[in-house]
C-alpha cells in the first residue's frame, strides 16, 4: 500500500523559518503534490503550494520556496513573519496524486518538545483517503 510521510523541521539558525518535507512511498508516477496547513486539502486546510512535475510549482504566502527534492519527494520552506510562531502548533498535510494509484495524503506537525534543527521522525500518519 502506498504511504505518504511528512516531516516538519525548524531551522536551527532562524527560529522563524520552517521546512516541510514530504515523500511518497509506493509505485506509480507522481502527477501532482498539494501541501496545505491547518488540515487536509479540501477539508478545512489552506493550500500552501502545488507542485506539478511537468508544469512547475505554485506557492502562496507564507510559503517561500517549494521544490522537488527527488522524483517522489518535495520540500516547502516557510517564513514566519510574525513575532510569535504559529507554525509550531500547526498541522501540515501533503497529498500526492499518483497514477494509477490515486491520491494519498498524510499530515504532520512539529513536535512540541522539538529543539531547533530537529525534525519529526518520518512516520506516516495516513489519512485513509484514496481517491
Amino acid at each position: 500500500t502506498p504511504e505518504v510521510w511528512v516531516q516538519v523541521q525548524m531551522e536551527a539558525t532562524e527560529l522563524s523559518s520552517f521546512t516541510v518535507h514530504c515523500g511518497f512511498l509506493g509505485p506509480g508516477s507522481i502527477s501532482l503534490v498539494t501541501v496545505s496547513w491547518g488540515g487536509p486539502d479540501g477539508a478545512g486546510g489552506t493550500k500552501l503550494a502545488v507542485l506539478h512535475p511537468e508544469l512547475g510549482t505554485r506557492q502562496w504566502a507564507p510559503a517561500r520556496q517549494a521544490r522537488w527534492e527527488t522524483q517522489s519527494s518535495i520540500s516547502l520552506a516557510l517564513e514566519d513573519s510574525g513575532a510569535s510562531s504559529p507554525f509550531a502548533n500547526t498541522t501540515f498535510c501533503c497529498k500526492f496524486a499518483s497514477f494509477p494509484e490515486g491520491s494519498w495524503e498524510s499530515c504532520g506537525s512539529l513536535p512540541p518538545s522539538s529543539d531547533p534543527g530537529l525534525s519529526a521522525p518520518p512516520t506516516p500518519v495516513p489519512i485513509l483517503r484514496a481517491d
Epitope: P53, E54, T57, Q65
Partner: nanobody, 118 residues
Framework: EVQLVESGGGLVQPGGSLRLSCAAS????????MGWYRQAPGKDRELVAT???????KYVDSVKGRFTISRGDAKNSLSLQMNSLRAEDTAVYYC????????????WGQGTMVTVSS
C-alpha cells in the same frame, strides 16, 4: 504543455550587444529552472546559462563576464543580455525550461538565430 517563444536574435558586429527574450505560455505554475542553450552550425547544442527559481545562476566559461541571464518578476520570462559578442557566439539560441528541476520533463523553444559578423 509549456510553450517557449524566443525573440531578439539578429545580425550584430563583433563587440556589439544583443538581448534575447523568452516568454513561457504557462503562467499558473512557476518553472523551476530556465536557461539558454546554443547550437552553432555543425556543432552539438551546448549550455550557455541557467537560472533557477531561487536565483542560482550558472554560465559556461566562454560567456562569463559577457552574458547575463535574468528572470522576470513573473518567474516565467527569461532574458539573456549578450555583450562583447564574438564571431564564435554565432549560433541558434534556444530557451529551455525544466519545471521540476529534475529533468522529468524539459521544454524547448523554437530557437532564434544570432549572427556575429562584420
Amino acid at each position: 504543455e509549456v510553450q517557449l517563444v524566443e525573440s531578439g536574435g539578429g545580425l550584430v558586429q563583433p563587440g556589439g550587444s544583443l538581448r534575447l527574450s523568452c516568454a513561457a505560455s504557462e503562467t499558473y505554475f512557476d518553472l523551476y529552472v530556465m536557461g539558454w542553450y546554443r547550437q552553432a552550425p555543425g556543432k552539438d547544442r551546448e549550455l550557455v546559462a541557467t537560472i533557477t527559481y531561487t536565483g542560482s545562476i550558472k554560465y559556461v566559461d566562454s560567456v562569463k563576464g559577457r552574458f547575463t541571464i535574468s528572470r522576470g518578476d513573473a518567474k516565467n520570462s527569461l532574458s539573456l543580455q549578450m555583450n562583447s559578442l564574438r564571431a564564435e557566439d554565432t549560433a541558434v539560441y534556444y530557451c529551455n525550461a525544466d519545471p521540476s528541476g529534475l529533468g522529468r520533463k524539459v521544454y524547448w523553444g523554437q530557437g532564434t538565430m544570432v549572427t556575429v559578423s562584420s
